[in-house]
């Protein structure tokens, strides 16, 4: 059996995890891709996914998760902004390819988010201040939709809305970009 390996990332609350998951361009460019969390002993939970078919460079925002699929480069960029301690856990990028198993992209990501002041004088964090401008998205409310489409008859109330509005901005303070280097087996 193939041993699943992990890459560990330690970040502070409020920072951003920025992961780039590489994939084989010819095979998976337009395939639907997803970001999943795996809790101990539980089935993977799909937190966010691209559209079907996946659109090139089209940001999809679900809560604090932003997915961008760069077909030209064969990579899925995943950002989790304003990290919280409870975000700590094991994550993976996957490609849906039914009826086959979801295809996991490289190592799983062990995210450890700790409390603390990031970007303070004397800290060794590469912290910057950024404003990511997220263009309007047409995020599908249901994820994934790779098998049998399910119709939504009611959008969530505004308090739980997860689709960014036109010209909405996500203000990120003390952002640390973590670039994930793909490992080819």
């Amino acid at each position: 059996a193939t041993k699943l390996t992990e890459e560990k990332y330690e970040l502070k609350e409020g920072q951003t995890l920025d992961v780039k998951c590489d994939y084989t361009l010819e095979k998976f460019a337009s395939s639907q891709k997803a970001w999943q969390i795996i809790r101990d002993g539980e089935m993977p939970k799909t937190l966010a996914c691209t559209e079907r078919p996946s659109k090139n460079s089209h940001p999809v925002q679900v809560g604090r998760i932003i997915l961008e699929d760069y077909h030209d480069h064969g990579l899925l960029r995943v950002r989790m902004v304003n990290l919280q301690v409870e975000d700590s856990g094991l994550y993976q990028c996957v490609i849906y390819q039914p009826p086959k198993e979801p295809h996991m992209l490289f190592d799983r990501i062990r995210l450890v988010v700790t409390k603390g002041f990031s970007g303070t004088p004397g800290s060794n964090e590469n912290s910057t201040q950024n404003v990511y401008k997220i263009p309007p998205t047409t995020t599908k409310a249901l994820c994934p939709l790779y098998t049998s489409p399910r119709t939504v008859t009611q959008a969530p109330p505004k308090s739980t809305a997860d689709v960014s509005t036109p010209d909405s901005e996500i203000n990120l303070t003390n952002v640390t970009d973590i670039i994930r280097v793909p490992v080819f087996n």
Partner: antibody, heavy 120, light 113 residues
Framework: QVQLQESGPGLVKPSETLSLTCAVS?????????WAWIRQPPGKGLEWIGS???????YYNPSLKSRVTISVDTSKNQFSLKLSSVTAADTAVYYC?????????????WGQGTLVTVSS | DIVMTQSPDSLAVSLGERATINCKSS????????????LAWYQQKPGQPPKLLIY???TRESGVPDRFSGSGSGTDFTLTISSLQAEDVAVYYC?????????FGGGTKVEIK
């Protein structure tokens, strides 16, 4: 339209093994999603027993784990439940359902259910 | 395990009136990263399996009348039937799918007053 149908003996003797099968139609199990068993004792609430993926990955309720086995047969598009060492407390309506816990977070759709009575 | 507590156990409401069912979880069922509450509501009529009404705490399933609505976040949730109809007489269950084992509330029986 996805439909599920439970089948199996309606009467099981104490200490024996309860065996049920859920036939899925209108959808290929091997295309994804998880598949669950839930039970409901007469006049009582619902209890999740466990779930399985088409690859065979299983997840069980710890309260029943030592006695439960869930398996899948993709060639027949069905999955099965075995509950060993049954007692009268296992008398219930047993339902199968598609488990969307990893996606939308719900069970949908459900089978009609089958009543299993444990009695000598 | 996350314990789901529903209240009241039973509820009698006049036709056309509002029915409100509460569900409280012992731990938060919110995944803050994607802002989703993994909380579902079901309707079960006698002799029938449960029918999904609401998932993600507030998203109505296809085909469910708009008099049914779900609200809440974290640990406190509400299912509201804005104008009770005769066909709404049933037992209603909440369920959490935030962490294993998946657990259900004890149910709330809704009747006509």
């Amino acid at each position: 339209q996805v439909q599920l149908q439970e089948s199996g003996p309606g009467l099981v003797k104490p200490s024996e093994t309860l065996s049920l099968t859920c036939a899925v139609s209108g959808y290929s199990i091997s295309s994804g999603y998880y598949w669950a068993w839930i039970r409901q004792p007469p006049g009582k609430g619902l209890e999740w027993i466990g779930s399985i993926y088409h690859s065979g990955s299983t997840y069980y309720n710890p309260s029943l784990k030592s006695r439960v086995t869930i398996s899948v047969d993709t060639s027949k598009n069905q999955f099965s439940l075995k509950l060993s060492s049954v007692t009268a407390a296992d008398t219930a309506v047993y339902y199968c359902a598609r488990d969307l816990g990893g996606y939308e977070g719900a069970f949908d759709p459900w089978g009609q259910g089958t009543l299993v009575t444990v009695s000598s | 395990d996350i314990v789901m507590t529903q209240s009241p156990d039973s509820l009698a409401v006049s036709l056309g009136e509002r029915a409100t069912i509460n569900c409280k979880s012992s731990q938060s069922v919110l995944y803050s990263s994607n802002n989703k509450n993994y909380l579902a509501w079901y309707q079960q009529k006698p002799g029938q399996p449960p029918k999904l009404l609401i998932y993600w705490a507030s998203t109505r399933e296809s085909g469910v009348p708009d008099r049914f609505s779900g609200s809440g976040s974290g640990t406190d949730f509400t299912l509201t039937i804005s104008s009770l109809q005769a066909e709404d007489v049933a037992v209603y269950y909440c369920q959490q799918l935030a962490s294993f084992p998946w657990t259900f509330g004890g149910g709330t029986k809704v009747e006509i007053k």
